[in-house]
């Protein structure tokens, strides 16, 4: 943005109203007064190029600084060759000073040359040559110094003509400021511009109305140059939640629309199954039955709960349940379905249940699965056991019902083998079992596990179709680990407990005998 | 009627020996596996090690994590078992109690490992402190 | 080692039933006693190879045994059944008694 100028003086302005002053009074510098265009034009001029030694000052009037910082005096003047006066003039100049002087307050008619400090020496781009002069074709030239910083309630230029042919016609003198701005939604104060040229003053926006500065953005910032120029623009406002970019303001959302959040998008149409929106909103209401989780976005349709598992099996195998579901034919809207399964036992002889979480063991957790099927083990014979498969999604949790299907089994597998020994020798043990007479028509063969006690390390197995076995070539005077498990078609059926069997020592005769 | 009587030192510095005796009164004292346990306060029962007299032998079995500091012995013709357990610290405070299983260790041929505890010792306090 | 797992609390209303988990790998297999302990007294047998009662022992307490999880039962709980109940089988791979961390019991 262009810098703006706030002028102090301005003598071409002032139609010679301004009465500086000059010193030596009488001598040097003279006010003229010329028509440029049919409109008078004045001028301050002195040409005293034939005698030595010149030493004449023209002084402006106080000027009151006010805000300036530093200050831009801009000058407009002539200069003639001192090569167009006769002889040359030895004396002639072609420069004149520029002085300046702070005080606060206007010493009137007394000057004193000590109190200025020089600015420059002026001089000139063009010189005006006899022929120009002659033909009234002047060389304007156009200079401009600054100062700063200044401090004191005002200040004087003063000029000092040391022996040339100028005329002065334009003196003005300005500061300048940044304007005000609008930009990324912040507005920026008109700002005077610092009086140092390297460093640039940083100047705070605020935001316009309905914009803030993002979570984590930085706040709005731009700084102004020596020339009143806005440089390096820093942080942004955006529009608030509810409210869009419409050129240099923020606008609510028309209804049907909304914005959730701070940022430079625009409104969005309300999303599938919510409610129409008034003006302005920051989200979109769930239509009654549909819900938003927490951690959905606002652009994401409203969802519902999935409905229960379509269709859910139980599929015993000994002492295991498979079950198996599809998954719910309305699954709410949302991918994220997790199934959860539980068990509930019944003990058939009192009727009495409870959860057998505890008791039981799953091919993977039960909480949470992904999968459409889990495997349960370690259930008990003779008891009956409800599964329940329930779907759940991200909004499930919003509301009180449930969606969930239930399947029943009863475990009949096999109860483990009652056993006792029956005989036994020096080398050998007789072992026989027996178990309940309904189950024994699904069993098609025993097999007998045994080992010696101590030895972890190695074991034999000996399978049979009866409820008896002689195992031989036994240590005398041993004990043996002996166990029998029940094979069934649908696998293993209950191992019995693990007996501890010893034969006879061999001082200890008697054959067989128990 | 079994009945066991427990006794011994019921304070100890660290790195002395604990040593417990029980009695075991009214039954029969041969063919049984004698246990110790002992329980540290506030906390669970922990099984020490169990003895067995069987002719002129002494079977022992120890718990692993003590095994290295535990000494079970037996004194027949007192009907007799006691407990030994060197280098103490302050882990090893706890009520000690002697058992005795339900059955014999085999009858007939059939053997009980680890059978259940029906009789047990009234309990030692032993404190291990400095 | 073989590792016994007991809930460290089980609560109950006085006339309901109480029933205290022993999880262990094929406990089945094995033969689960049950003790109960009172502050300040040795234990007492309850139930021994998994479901036998003690001379003494009332009929309200039961247990059961298969696959990993053996259970004590205690039907029509009374006040003075509240006490720290303990399993305890014998592990034939290393040879020792192996006790469950203990249940406590509590008689709302």
């Known amino acids: 943005a262009q810098g703006k100028e706030v002028v102090l003086l301005d003598f071409a302005a002032a139609g010679g109203e301004l009465g500086w002053l000059t010193h030596p009074y009488g001598k040097g510098w003279d006010l003229m007064q010329n028509i440029m265009n049919d409109m008078p034009i004045y001028m301050y001029s002195v040409c005293n190029v034939m005698s030595g030694d010149q030493d004449n000052w023209l002084r402006t009037n106080w000027v009151y600084r006010g805000e300036a910082e530093r200050i831009f005096i801009e000058l407009k003047f002539t200069v003639r060759d001192c090569n167009s006066f006769p002889g040359g003039a030895s004396s002639c100049k072609e420069t004149f000073n520029l002085y300046y002087a702070e005080s606060d307050l206007d010493y009137g008619t007394n000057f004193q040359k000590r109190l200025f400090t020089k600015i420059d020496t002026i001089a000139p781009d063009e010189i005006t040559v006899s022929s120009d002069f002659e033909a009234r074709h002047v060389k304007l030239n156009v200079e401009e110094r600054s100062v700063g910083p200044l401090t004191r309630k005002g200040f004087y230029l003063a000029f000092q003509d040391i022996g040339a042919c100028v005329a002065l016609l334009s003196v003005r003198v300005y500061y300048k400021k940044c304007p005000e701005l609008l930009q990324g939604l912040a507005h920026f104060p008109e700002t005077i511009a610092g009086s140092d040229a390297p460093s640039l003053a940083t100047v705070a926006g605020t935001c316009v109305d309905h914009a803030v500065v993002p979570p984590g953005g930085e706040e709005p910032r731009m700084h102004c140059a020596v020339d009143g120029e806005w440089l390096v623009p820093i942080g942004q406002c955006l529009c608030q939640a509810g409210y869009e970019k419409v050129e240099d303001a923020c606008q609510a959302c028309s209804p049907g629309f909304f914005k959730f959040e701070a940022s430079e998008s625009p409104c969005l149409e309300c999303p599938e199954h919510t409610l129409p929106s008034p003006e302005g909103a920051t989200s979109c209401e769930c239509e009654e039955g549909f819900f938003r989780a927490p951690q959905d976005p606002a652009s994401m349709p409203c969802t519902r709960p999935p409905s229960a598992p379509h269709y859910l099996t139980a599929v015993g195998m000994g002492a295991k349940v498979e079950l198996r579901w599809t998954p719910p034919q309305d699954s709410g809207g949302r991918e994220d379905i997790v199934y959860s399964v539980t068990c509930e036992q019944c003990w058939p002889e009192s009727g009495e249940c409870g959860p057998c979480e505890a008791s039981v063991r799953y091919s993977e957790p039960p909480h949470g699965l992904t999968r459409t099927s889990v495997t349960v083990s370690d259930l008990e014979p003779h008891m009956n056991y409800t599964f329940t498969v329930e779907a759940r999604n991200g909004v499930s949790g919003l509301v009180t019902s449930r969606s969930f299907r239930t399947a029943s089994v009863s475990i009949n597998q096999t109860e483990p083998p009652k056993v006792r020994l029956e005989g036994r020798s020096t080398t050998s043990l007789s072992v026989s079992w027996s178990i309940p007479p309904p189950q024994q028509s699904r069993v098609w063969k025993y097999e007998v596990t045994y080992r010696k006690k101590g030895d972890s390390n190695s074991y034999n197995v000996r399978r049979t179709e009866g409820f008896s076995v002689t195992l031989d070539d036994l240590a005398p005077d041993t004990t043996y680990l002996v166990q029998v498990q029940a094979l069934t078609q649908e696998g293993q059926g209950a191992g019995s407990k693990v007996h501890e069997f010893q034969t006879l020592s061999p001082e200890g005769s008697g054959n067989l005998a128990v | 009627q079994v009945q066991l009587q427990q006794w011994g030192a019921g304070l100890l510095k660290p790195s002395e020996t604990l040593s417990l005796t029980c009695a075991v009164y009214g039954g029969s004292f041969s063919g049984y596996y004698w246990s110790w346990i002992r329980q540290p306060p506030g906390k669970g029962l922990e099984w020490i090690g169990e003895?067995?007299?069987?002719?002129?032998?002494?079977?022992?079995n120890y718990n692993p994590s003590l095994k290295s500091r535990v000494t079970i012995s037996v004194d027949t013709s007192k009907n007799q078992f006691s407990l030994k357990l060197s280098s103490v610290t302050a882990a090893d405070t706890a009520v000690y109690y002697c058992?005795?299983?339900?059955?014999?260790?085999?009858?007939?041929?059939?053997?009980?490992?680890?059978?259940?505890?029906?009789?047990w010792g009234q309990g030692t306090m032993v404190t291990v402190a400095s | 080692s073989y590792v016994l797992t007991q809930p460290p609390s089980v609560s109950v209303a006085p006339g309901q039933t109480a029933r205290i988990t022993c999880r262990g790998n094929?406990?089945?297999?094995?033969?689960v006693h049950w003790y109960q302990q009172k502050p300040g007294q040795a234990p007492v047998l309850v139930v021994y190879?998994?479901?036998d009662r003690p001379s003494g022992i009332p009929e309200r307490f039961s247990g059961s045994n298969s696959g990993n999880t053996a259970t004590l039962t205690i039907s029509r709980v009374e006040a003075g059944d509240e006490a720290d109940y303990y399993c305890?089988?014998?592990?034939?791979?290393?040879?020792?008694?192996?006790f469950g961390g203990g249940t406590k019991l509590t008689v709302l």
């Open positions: 305890q089988v014998w592990d034939h791979s290393s040879d020792h008694v192996v």
């Open positions: 094929n406990i089945g297999s094995k033969n």
């Open positions: 003895i067995n007299h069987r002719g002129s032998i002494n079977y022992n």
């Open positions: 058992a005795k299983p339900l059955r014999p260790h085999c009858t007939n041929g059939v053997c009980y490992s680890g059978d259940a505890f029906d009789i």
């Open positions: 190879d998994d479901s």
